[in-house]
């Protein structure tokens, strides 16, 4: 049986034109589903806002490498978080929609608090 049939799908339809300060970011998600118009990075800020970014941009690639390094220092494995954090606000500067699909994206937590965990996207239908 396929895993997590009703897991969520987050899609980005446009990207932020602005470079976000690294200090504001908590985590990111890779968006790769063929049901989305394009592959994308969704940055999750410390205020739980989501920002779509172009994964081809050098600053985005640098940021996600930094987030990966930070996550490995603080969290030995990627864990999962409840939906509430990602439901809390609309994304910044971009259109972002959610559909339902198995394992649409993976999010990597990077904060150092022992209570913080990795997150996956959530169904908001």
């Amino acid at each position: 049986q396929p895993d997590a049939v009703n897991a969520p799908l987050t899609c980005c339809y446009s990207f932020t034109s602005k470079m976000i300060p690294m200090s504001r970011l908590e985590s990111y998600k890779r968006i790769t589903s063929s049901r989305c118009p394009k592959e994308a990075v969704v940055f999750v800020t410390k205020l739980k806002r989501e920002v779509c970014a172009d994964p081809k941009k050098e600053w985005v690639q640098t940021y996600i490498k930094n987030l990966d390094r930070n996550q490995m220092r603080s969290e030995p494995t990627t864990l999962f978080k409840t939906a509430s954090a990602l439901r809390s606000s609309a994304p910044l500067n971009v259109k972002l929609t959610r559909k339902s699909e198995a394992n649409a994206s993976t999010t990597f937590s990077t904060t150092t608090s022992s209570t913080s965990v990795g997150v996956t996207s959530v169904t908001v239908n």
Epitope: R30, T32, S34, P37, K38, E39, P55, K56, K65, D68, R69, Q71, M72, T77, T78, T106, F108
Partner: antibody, heavy 117, light 107 residues
């Protein structure tokens, strides 16, 4: 539905060149990176390089640098891989694949290239 | 370049067995590891990315774990369709490199 359809099998002489095509449907190739991976008979997978079709920027495994050319035509959603100065060790199945993050979620069906005198 | 060492190179198992394949990188790859399944005459199929994230449609008997330089693919209960060759791949830095593969055969 994403599909990558590659050109047919080729038989080449040592010292010659081969050009393999990969036509994409169900995605805009300028939004992703197109990669080329090869697999010699009975062997493992070997990444050769990739192109950003939006601007033509390429990156290669140093092992292939200077011998491989990767191009893309966004108007036909097609990526190309040309390998020159062929030798018998280049006999392999050549795959195109997409992936902006460095892993490959969609693959072509593969193109067999045989180098033989 | 980052080298990926996969073990074992082959294993024999029966339907229902729990199978574990390991992959070791020569340096920290920060969970940027993918696992693929390949059947004879076919292109590889992505199973897992980001060390643990199962791709859409991949059965939940497949799971990935690990961190740093050491990663594992586990098949909790081997099914007839799982007999294939499995490859790990690091995508931390180019050139992207694959493990040598693990052939899972019927005992």
């Amino acid at each position: 539905q994403v599909q990558l359809v590659q050109s047919g099998a080729e038989v080449k002489k040592p010292g010659s060149s081969v050009k393999v095509s990969c036509k994409a449907s169900g995605l805009t190739i300028s939004d992703t990176y197109m990669h080329w991976v090869r697999q010699a008979p009975g062997q493992g997978l070997e990444w050769m390089g990739r192109i950003d079709p939006a601007n033509g920027n390429t990156k290669f495994d140093p092992k292939f640098q200077g011998r491989v050319t990767i191009t893309a035509d966004t108007s036909t959603s097609t990526a190309y891989m040309e390998l020159s100065s062929l030798r018998s060790e280049d006999t392999a199945v050549y795959y195109c694949a997409r992936g902006v993050f460095g892993f490959f979620d969609y693959w072509g069906q593969g193109t067999t290239v045989t180098v033989s005198s | 370049d980052i080298q990926m060492t996969q073990s074992p190179s082959s294993l024999s198992a029966s339907v229902g067995d729990r199978v574990t394949i390991t992959c070791k990188a020569t340096e920290d790859i920060y969970n940027r590891l993918a696992w693929y399944q390949q059947k004879p005459g076919k292109a590889p199929k992505l199973l897992i990315s980001g060390a643990t994230s199962l791709e859409t449609g991949v059965p939940s008997r497949f799971s990935g774990s690990g961190s740093g330089t050491d990663y594992t693919l586990t098949i909790s209960s081997l099914q007839p369709e799982d007999f294939a060759t499995y490859y790990c791949q690091q995508f931390w830095s180019a050139p992207y490199t694959f493990g040598g593969g693990t052939k899972v055969e019927i005992k």
